[in-house]
């Protein structure tokens, strides 16, 4: 008989290489039986995982699995790092493996003026 525990299917040491300035959806695959659990995302800062409260999230339901999605619109250089999703189920906290975003800044400092320089052109 299949387990009715909540399961989070993020692979151990999974990574995503993404570009700053474009959108990205980070998916947490969630398997549950009856009631959908409360799921949150957090970002690792050393040994603590800081809950992402002001970020846009959504659910995508598929036949055999659901996805809790963290939206990046767009990806920022500061989004580089490791993330984890967690589910609250029957007073139990289930945590996923961490998944890492490797963000490439497509406008590196060498080829791109700062916002202040750009703004000064705006005012010129």
């Amino acid at each position: 008989k299949e387990s009715c525990d909540v399961q989070l299917y993020i692979k151990r040491q999974s990574e995503h290489s993404i570009l700053a300035g474009d959108p990205f959806e980070l998916e947490c695959p969630v398997k549950y039986c009856a009631n959908r659990p409360h799921v949150t995302w957090c970002k690792l800062n050393g040994t603590t995982c800081v809950k992402l409260e002001d970020r846009q999230t959504s659910w995508k339901e598929e036949k055999n699995i659901s996805f809790f999605i963290l939206h990046f619109e767009p990806v920022l250089p500061n989004d580089n790092g490791s993330y984890r999703c967690s589910a609250n189920f029957q007073s139990n906290l289930i945590e996923s493996h961490s998944t890492t975003l490797r963000v490439t800044d497509v406008k590196s400092a060498s080829e791109r003026p700062s916002k202040d320089e750009m703004a000064s052109r705006f005012w010129a």
């Epitope: 700053a20 474009d22 959108p23 002001d54 846009q56 619109e73 767009p74 500061n78």
Partner: antibody, heavy 120, light 106 residues
Framework: QVQLKESGPGLVAPSQSLSITCTVS????????VHWVRQSPGKGLEWLGV???????SYNPAPMSRLSISKDNSKSQVFLKMNSLQTDDTAMYYC??????????????WGQGTSVTVSS | QIVLSQSPAILSASPGEKVTMTCRAS?????MHWYQQKPGSSPKPWIY???NLASGVPARFSGSGSGTSYSLTISRMEAEDAATYYC?????????FGGGTKLEIK
């Protein structure tokens, strides 16, 4: 020098479609996103959608079913198409460049806008 | 969607007076942008990410806030500051603007 310039029809009949072109210079559409924002006396400033550098789009869910944004990177042009216009779509339509810093995203350069009136 | 409510809608200030306008969000946002618009012109970026002045903006302007409450302050009002100021959130789609505060000079 960064510039964005909108060109539109000015007058559109009710139930017809609207097409506006935004021609940009001073930056590449493969590096920066371009947004569409409209301003009407009744609704104030309203974000409509964005064409991201990689070619994906995001839309405001309210008018999304009537909106389409596309681009031609080689011509440095972004296009807004809106179907089934009604009188409350009368507004000034702006194309706006989006840019990111380390930890935030903002719209920095605005076009001068193109005025669209929906009337028979 | 996140609704941004600006108050007051209209504000009249004398030269040299301190001016504060507020922007309240219906849900918590990460940061707030502010734009200035004068009649017949496009909006101009004025304050980025709550407190960073856009280049060319006089130092008498400042921004502050967090969560659902943000404000723009002018330490000493000048005639050239008369304009409409809009707050704008980039935390959740649809990315919304406030209704604006029209600042007039007495």
């Amino acid at each position: 020098q960064v510039q964005l310039k909108e060109s539109g029809p000015g007058l559109v009949a009710p139930s017809q479609s609207l097409s506006i072109t935004c021609t940009v210079s001073g930056f590449s559409l493969t590096t920066y996103g371009v947004h569409w924002v409209r301003q009407s006396p009744g609704k104030g400033l309203e974000w409509l959608g964005v064409m991201w550098p990689g070619g994906r789009t995001s839309y405001n869910p309210a008018p999304m079913s009537r909106l389409s944004i596309s681009k031609d990177n080689s011509k440095s042009q972004v296009f807004l198409k809106m179907n089934s216009l009604q009188t409350d779509d009368t507004a000034m339509y702006y194309c706006v460049r989006g840019d990111y810093e380390y930890d935030y995203y903002a719209m920095d350069y605005w076009g001068q806008g193109t005025s669209v009136t929906v009337s028979s | 969607q996140i609704v941004l409510s600006q108050s007051p809608a209209i504000l009249s200030a004398s030269p040299g007076e301190k001016v504060t306008m507020t922007c309240r969000a219906s849900s918590s946002v990460s940061y707030m942008h502010w734009y200035q618009q004068k009649p017949g012109s496009s909006p101009k970026p004025w304050i980025y990410a709550t407190s960073n002045l856009a280049s060319g903006v006089p130092a008498r302007f400042s921004g502050s806030g967090s969560g659902t409450s943000y404000s723009l302050t002018i330490s000493r009002m000048e005639a050239e500051d008369a304009a409409t100021y809009y707050c704008h959130q980039w935390s959740s789609n649809p990315y919304t603007f406030g209704g604006g505060t029209k600042l007039e000079i007495k």
